[in-house]
């Protein structure tokens, strides 16, 4: 049970909290998910480092509560979504409180530097935010609850410290708790007030319902400082590995089943890829090659590691690269596959590689990618790189083997050569043609060789033949006499082949041509 001491959502006028400095937190009127007007505080001083913006509530009377809860609903912008901001951008803020017997003059500058604040916690945007429609805009709203105490003074102030985030404090609710009357674990317990300390436990005597087994005597439930019931001793329940039988007995879970905790109602069949060979198992062990992540409950199937990513596509633009790939064929039975990029800078011959410099930038990040795409920049020009794309899931850390990966070799800032502008016939025989050509206007590197494509004009282009030349001349042999051949040439550098040149036609000599040429050569 909760009793509210302050709730900004019920405020009809300005909250009138104190901001220091004035250029920090700003009170703004907004809308909640029901289009009710709410008072919010926002701050977004992300361009300047060393931010220290404080926001202090009005005085809150504790009404005899010893332990206080603060529920904060807020939205934080990802630093990555903010244009051109420095690394000092934050996605967290701090919560403090200050105990006092009376209202104090918070406008005085001395209060900010001398008040003995007590830090409650650093508050971060949780991964499990809810998408809420605030006045026509879908926002990622985080709800975080923190508690503090014991309190002895008449009341207190809350203080929120921003040190470089772009965020909005949508609502703050301050309350305390009592443990309600409940039926739990086969016993009935009365309503009980919480204790003075966060560690204090207030004993409540319970009565087992018929046919529940007393774990210990006397049967006790403890109301902790957070207003939650705890059962450290004397529980009326069946222990792990055993289940209630008609609420009168606890029988062992048969082989192939398990019961993980006292709170579970009954035995369950072992999940996929696990087994329990004996009776009374509290957990099913994973089969070889299958694992549980640290936070996987015993009820879920054991899972395996993913296979490697597939079909990598790389797009090189000077000293930047975009890598895209397809997800692994096998996810290991999990839906938390992420990707890590291992960047290695190599020697020209690729015989040895080393880890990339720290200044290489990965967008959105290098590790824990959720999308099959990464943009990599600030690489060295004209440098070979190898990128390993690892597929990781929640159980990869449990496997003795390294993560499956796919590698891609890339050389930065190296364009393919431009087209060869023209070809000349040097000579021709009945069965050969000798050609020459100039180097491409933009070789974009050292030309390794040329590839010549040729085919008889009467025939289909798809039946073409290929020849290679280390220089910019080539003799094509094995041709038929008196035939017209269509010829194209393209250059190759380490970056690959350029485009083929335009099609040019050349003809071998006929038998008559050849004889007349011989006659002309006679003295």
């Amino acid at each position: 049970m909760e009793e509210t001491l302050m709730d900004t959502r019920t405020a009809t006028a300005e909250l009138g909290w104190t901001a220091n400095p004035a250029s920090g937190w700003e009170e703004v009127s907004g809308y909640d998910e029901n289009l009710n007007t709410i008072r919010t505080y926002q701050v977004c001083n992300v361009f300047e480092p060393n931010q220290n913006n404080w926001l202090l509530t009005t005085f809150i009377n504790r009404r005899g509560a010893h332990r206080i809860y603060t529920e904060m609903r807020f939205t934080v912008r990802d630093c990555s979504s903010l244009p051109n901001v420095p690394g000092s951008c934050k996605e967290t803020f701090n919560l403090y409180y200050y105990e006092t017997d009376s209202v104090i003059a918070t406008k005085k500058s001395a209060f900010w530097s001398e008040a003995p604040y007590l830090k409650v916690d650093t508050i971060a945007a949780d991964e499990s935010f809810s998408q809420v429609d605030f006045g026509g805009r879908l926002m990622k709203v985080n709800t975080e609850v923190r508690s503090f105490g014991p309190l002895t003074r008449n009341g207190f102030y809350l203080a929120f410290q921003d040190y470089g985030a772009c965020m909005s404090l949508l609502s703050v609710r301050v309350f305390f708790k009592k443990c309600p009357s409940i039926v739990q674990n086969f016993a009935v317990f009365p309503e009980t007030m919480t204790g003075a300390e966060s560690t204090s436990l207030v004993i409540a005597r319970g009565t087992c319902i018929p046919n529940a087994e007393e774990v210990d005597v006397p049967i006790k439930l403890y109301c902790n400082g957070d207003g939650e019931w705890m059962v450290p001793i004397g529980r009326c329940t069946c222990k792990a590995g055993y289940e209630p039988e008609n609420s009168v007995a606890c029988k062992a879970c048969p082989a192939g089943t398990f019961k993980a905790s006292q709170e579970a109602e009954g035995c369950s069949h072992c999940p996929s890829n696990s087994r329990s060979p004996s009776e009374a198992s509290p957990i099913c062990t994973c089969r070889t090659g299958y694992y549980r992540a640290d936070f996987d409950p015993p009820e879920v199937a054991c899972t395996s590691v993913p296979s490697g990513p597939r079909n990598v596509i790389s797009i090189v633009n000077e000293t930047s690269i975009i890598l895209e790939w397809h997800p692994p064929r096998e996810t290991g039975g999990r839906d938390d596959v992420t990707y890590n990029i291992i960047c290695k800078k190599c020697r020209a011959d690729r015989r040895s590689c080393s880890r990339c410099d720290d200044n290489v930038e990965f967008v959105p990040r290098q590790l824990g990618l959720t999308e099959c795409r990464v943009s990599i920049s600030s690489l060295w020009a004209h440098t070979p790189y190898t990128f390993d794309i690892q597929a990781i899931n929640g159980v990869s850390s449990k496997s003795p083997f390294p993560p499956q990966h796919v590698s891609v070799n890339i050389t930065t800032n190296q364009a393919a050569p431009s087209t060869v502008p023209i070809m000349h016939q040097v000579s021709a025989t009945m069965r050969s043609i000798t050609l020459s050509w100039p180097q491409p206007e933009q070789p974009n590197g050292i030309i390794l060789d040329y590839e010549i494509r040729y085919y008889e004009k009467e025939h289909n282009e798809f039946n073409s033949s290929m020849a290679r030349s280390q220089t910019n001349t080539a003799r094509i042999d094995g041709l038929r006499p008196g035939m017209v051949y269509v010829v194209q040439v393209r250059a190759r550098t380490v970056a690959g082949y350029g485009k083929f040149s335009g099609k040019m036609c050349f003809q071998t000599l006929t038998d008559d041509d050849y004889k007349s040429e011989l006659r002309e050569q006679l003295p």
Partner: antibody
Framework: QVQLLQSGAEVKKPGASVKVPCKAS????????MSWVRQAPGQGLEWMGW????????TYAQGFTGRFVFSLDTSVSTAYLQISSLKAEDTAVYYC??????????????WGQGTLVTVSS | EIVLTQSPATLSVSPGERATLSCRAS??????LAWYQQKPGQAPRLLIY???TRATGIPDRFSASGSGTDFTLTISRVEPEDFAVYYC????????FGQGTKVEIK
């Protein structure tokens, strides 16, 4: 009050250079990025890019690399746009604008009055 | 580059009438869209950011909505000082402006 003050009109010959200042006052210069926007006569707005006033790191939009340079002098709270090798098609009003970031979105909330640069032989 | 297309190019309305301006993006920009007003011989003025949040000092007759690729700016009752050119601008990927919609007196 918060304002951005730009210099008066400039007339330049093709091939020349121009440096347009934008002096900020009424706020902490390094707390906000500065954007540059071009508007050719009778045309719409074209975003040229921005500069982080804290780090000096510029970002240029497509079509505004090479001849266009953003720079700063934080000691006098001034941002500069320099255009070299001027062409007739560079004739336009050039605006500086403060970039305001909030948790709800971004926008250019304070604008200079604009500087008309005319390129003519 | 994300292209923003505004329609109509010109909107003729009488004072007191409602004006609805449209802006369509070539691909999704989420809620990363702003609206600006520009009067002849003046610098633009920020009206809306985050697709629907009014900038400081903007009258509540100006409202905006939309997300993804389709956005709308509405002037509930057009005042004489509202006749101007209105531009949308996205900041989802780099920044680009629409070509503008001129609101003129009918």
């Amino acid at each position: 009050q918060v304002q951005l003050l730009q210099s008066g009109a400039e007339v330049k010959k093709p091939g020349a250079s121009v440096k347009v200042p934008c002096k900020a006052s009424g706020y902490t210069f390094t707390s906000y990025a500065m954007s540059w926007v071009r508007q050719a006569p009778g045309q719409g707005l074209e975003w040229m890019g921005w500069i982080n006033t804290n780090t000096g790191n510029p970002t240029y939009a497509q079509g505004f690399t090479g001849r266009f340079v953003f720079s700063l002098d934080t000691s006098v709270s001034t941002a500069y746009l320099q255009i070299s090798s001027l062409k007739a098609e560079d004739t336009a009003v050039y605006y500086c604008a403060r970039v305001r970031l909030t948790v709800y979105g971004d926008g250019m909330d304070v604008w200079g009055q604009g500087t008309l640069v005319t390129v003519s032989s | 580059e994300i292209v923003l297309t505004q329609s109509p190019a010109t909107l003729s309305v009488s004072p007191g009438e409602r004006a609805t301006l449209s802006c369509r993006a070539s691909q999704s920009v989420s809620s990363n869209l702003a609206w600006y007003q520009q009067k002849p011989g003046q610098a633009p003025r920020l009206l809306i950011y985050g697709a629907s949040t009014r900038a400081t000092g903007i009258p509540d007759r100006f409202s905006a909505s939309g997300s993804g690729t389709d956005f709308t700016l509405t002037i509930s009752r057009v005042e004489p000082e509202d006749f101007a050119v209105y531009y949308c601008q996205q900041y989802g990927s780099s920044w680009t402006f629409g070509q503008g919609t001129k609101v003129e007196i009918k």
